[in-house]
């Protein structure tokens, strides 16, 4: 069993290395920014990311592309729930520095949890999305 878990971890690691999670990150950022735009946030505020949604994209145009590609990538993890969780954790880690404030972080986390279902995939049952400097409970 230990050997199997080790192989599983290695397989998951190589799957994660070949996955492109950027479309998922962009899709989620678009979603939470669209929500904020409707509450009066300045849609033209500058961003560090060359592919962050333009004000035009944020109103919905272009977002289906990020979602489609994102779902394709997550689909690769469909038969490995633990690995799917690690993919979601990686998305959270990658974007944590760009999230402004606790509210935006919670919103991002909520959307992230819904992401597999949005793609028609099974969501991992237990998946800790807390970003900490220390170790993380992995199931």
């Amino acid at each position: 069993r230990q050997q199997w878990e080790l192989q599983g971890d290695r397989r998951c690691q190589s799957q994660l290395e070949r996955a492109n999670l950027r479309p998922c990150e962009q899709h989620l950022m678009q979603k939470i920014q669209r929500d904020e735009d409707s509450y009066g946030r300045d849609p033209y505020s500058p961003s560090q990311d060359p592919y962050s949604p333009s004000p035009y994209d944020r109103r919905g145009a272009g977002s289906s592309q990020h979602q489609e590609r994102c779902c394709n990538e997550l689909n690769e993890f469909e038969n490995n729930q633990r690995c799917m969780c690690e993919a979601l954790q990686q998305i959270m880690e990658n974007q944590s520095d760009r999230l402004q404030g606790r509210q935006q972080e919670q919103q991002f986390k909520r959307e992230l949890r819904n992401l597999p279902q949005q793609c028609g995939l099974r969501a991992p049952q237990r998946c800790d999305l807390e970003v900490e400097s220390g170790g993380r409970d992995r199931y």
Partner: antibody, heavy 123, light 108 residues
């Protein structure tokens, strides 16, 4: 050397079938999404089909949907295109192309192409 | 289906001149999913630009891509003899992953 080599093209009658193959070498085939793109004589490029790394997501152009089937065998480093109910308008050079992405920013692109194999549908 | 329309169909210029090729999408395309390819007669396409503006490895800096939303541009600042070819834009965000019909860049 990173390489893609297509084979299986030829002359076939309308309504007939053909199976194209693409042999990959010089890279870890199972790490990449793959595509078929075709080009009719004197015409532009037309995307035909794509398949993800573990074959979990497959897409087709409307013009070939229901007639063509893309598949891959990661153990054999090979990509396939089964073409049934062939029509005159399927006459083209068929290219196999590897899809990669920019690790830091995310955009996808087809960076490695085969030389193509010619399919001629004619009675 | 996202339809990409390239213009002009043919562009006749001389070496040393600047070439501006346009690609217009029927609906918005995220920059992340806009690619440019070059194809010479009898050869397979060659990747030029991805993510709308990032040059692929080994592509000279005279090639540049720009644009967003529905309007994208490929610019070749000073044409070299080897640049005369057909150029295609492609979107790979929404299936089907469509190509434009191409712009033929020919020597004047």
């Amino acid at each position: 050397e990173v390489q893609l080599v297509e084979s299986g093209g030829g002359l076939v009658q309308p309504g007939g079938s053909l199976r194209l193959s693409c042999a990959a070498s010089g890279f870890i085939f199972s790490d990449y999404n793959m595509n078929w793109v075709r080009q009719a004589p004197g015409k532009g490029l037309e995307w035909v089909s794509s398949i993800t790394r573990s074959s979990r997501t497959i897409y087709y152009a409307d013009s070939v949907k229901g007639r063509f089937t893309i598949s891959r065998d990661n153990a054999k480093n090979s990509l396939y295109l089964q073409m049934n109910s062939l029509r005159d308008e399927d006459t083209a050079v068929y290219y196999c192309a590897r899809e990669d992405f920019d690790v830091s920013t995310g955009p996808y692109y087809m960076d490695v192409w085969g030389k193509g194999t010619t399919v001629t549908v004619s009675s | 289906e996202i339809v990409l329309t390239q213009s002009p169909g043919t562009l006749s210029l001389s070496p040393g001149e600047r070439a501006t090729l346009s690609c217009r999408a029927s609906q918005s395309v995220s920059n992340m999913f806009l690619v440019w390819y070059q194809q010479k007669p009898g050869q397979a396409p060659r990747l030029l630009i991805y993510g709308a503006s990032t040059r692929a490895t080994g592509i000279p800096d005279r090639f540049s891509g720009s644009g967003s939303g529905t309007d994208f541009t490929l610019t070749i600042s000073r044409l070299e003899p080897e640049d005369f070819a057909v150029y295609y834009c492609q979107q790979n965000g929404n299936s089907p992953y469509t190509f434009g019909q191409g712009t033929k860049l020919e020597i004047k």
